[in-house]
């Protein structure tokens, strides 16, 4: 029986050009994870191994950091890269537990910012 | 340049155990994972599993669990690959082969070992 | 575990012809898929990684395409060296697994 849950930092934004750390957390079971698969829709991420440790898929290699821990950075984001976003975490005994996040990337407001500033 | 040279054939009897040898040469060798993938003559490849020098940290494929057990010495970048209770099927080609860097594909194999067991 | 099933087993063409091979994963693998080639007597070596990238120095005449569960591996132009056994390996999910290969010959 599976009794784990995955918590996950849910909806959150983030400015184009910018970076984000994608996290879930599987609790309560004392399943062992195996590993973890980051998925964009139907695209593959990257895959972090308990032993093995990162693969990075090279179509996100340039954009794609490991960690922190299981977690996945995106770095130089784009408007395209606004959607829905798994980590599929694969336990043994139990099986298979998948979190969701969605990630909205906001056009960059560094222009707005950098009037509120003057240097005198 | 990189190198992985595996030991020479062997010769066992069913019920007993061998090991086989993967020294590396030319690149970093705690800084990628090393798995072992054999080959039944004429046959398909089989991965048997993969550890991480650096942790020692191992993944088996769970037909082997129990019967491989996988092994490093960091101190001459070799790798060890041991098979107990042999039977007659296990009578292949065990390779040694090394992963690109972040990425799970084999890029530098052994050349081979062959392991025969006979009664 | 995942079953990569690949066809045809074996295959007979002439030189400069295009060949095709295929490969299908029991459930979705993405693109976690790579080809290899292995001469007689040889080790396997790697062609193409994550469906579809050319592994440094292969020639531009092997290619891949696929994802989720059917995969193409391509010949465009079958050369004498050609003469190999290919294989389809997926790395999705552990225990990695091989199709059962295919082998060129040339007529």
């Known amino acids: 029986m599976m009794t784990g849950t995955i918590e996950t930092t849910g909806n959150i934004s983030a400015e184009k050009g910018g970076s984000i750390i994608l996290q879930c957390h599987l609790s309560s079971t004392t399943a062992q994870v195996t590993q973890v698969n980051w998925e964009q829709q139907d695209q593959l991420l990257a895959i972090c191994n308990a032993d093995l440790g990162w693969h990075i898929s090279p179509s996100f290699k340039d954009r794609v950091a490991p960690g922190p821990g299981l977690g996945l950075t995106l770095q130089s984001l784009t408007v395209n890269d606004t959607g829905e976003y798994f980590c599929i975490y694969h336990t043994y005994p139990d099986g298979t537990y998948t979190g969701r996040i969605f990630l909205e990337v906001l056009e960059s407001s560094v222009a707005e910012h950098g009037a509120r500033f003057q240097i005198p | 340049q990189v190198q992985l040279v595996q030991s020479g054939a062997e010769v066992k009897k069913p019920g007993a155990s061998v090991k086989v040898s993967c020294k590396t040469s030319g690149y970093a060798f705690t800084e990628y994972t090393m798995h072992w993938v054999r080959q039944a003559p004429g046959k398909g490849l089989e991965w048997m599993g993969g550890i991480n020098p650096n942790t020692g940290g191992t993944t088996y494929n769970q037909k082997f669990q129990g019967r491989v057990t996988l092994t490093v010495d960091k101190s001459s970048s070799t790798a060890y690959m041991e098979l107990s209770s042999l039977r007659s099927e296990d009578t292949v080609v065990y390779y040694c082969a090394k992963l690109l860097r972040l990425m799970y594909y084999f890029d530098y194999w052994g050349q081979g070992t062959l392991v025969t067991v006979s009664s | 575990d995942i079953q990569m099933t690949q066809s045809p087993s074996s295959l007979s063409a002439s030189v400069g012809d295009r060949v095709t091979i295929t490969c299908q994963a029991s459930?979705?693998?993405?693109?976690?898929v790579a080809w290899y080639q292995q001469k007689p007597g040889k080790a396997p070596k790697l062609l193409i990684y994550s469906a579809s990238y050319r592994y440094t120095g292969v020639p531009s005449r092997f290619s891949g395409s696929g994802s989720g569960t059917d995969f193409t591996f391509t010949i465009s132009s079958l050369q004498p060296e050609d003469i190999a056994t290919y294989y389809c390996?997926?790395?999705?999910?552990?225990?990695?697994?091989f199709g059962g290969g295919t082998k060129v010959e040339i007529k």
């Open positions: 459930q979705d693998v993405r693109t976690a």
């Open positions: 390996h997926q790395h999705y999910i552990t225990p990695w697994t």
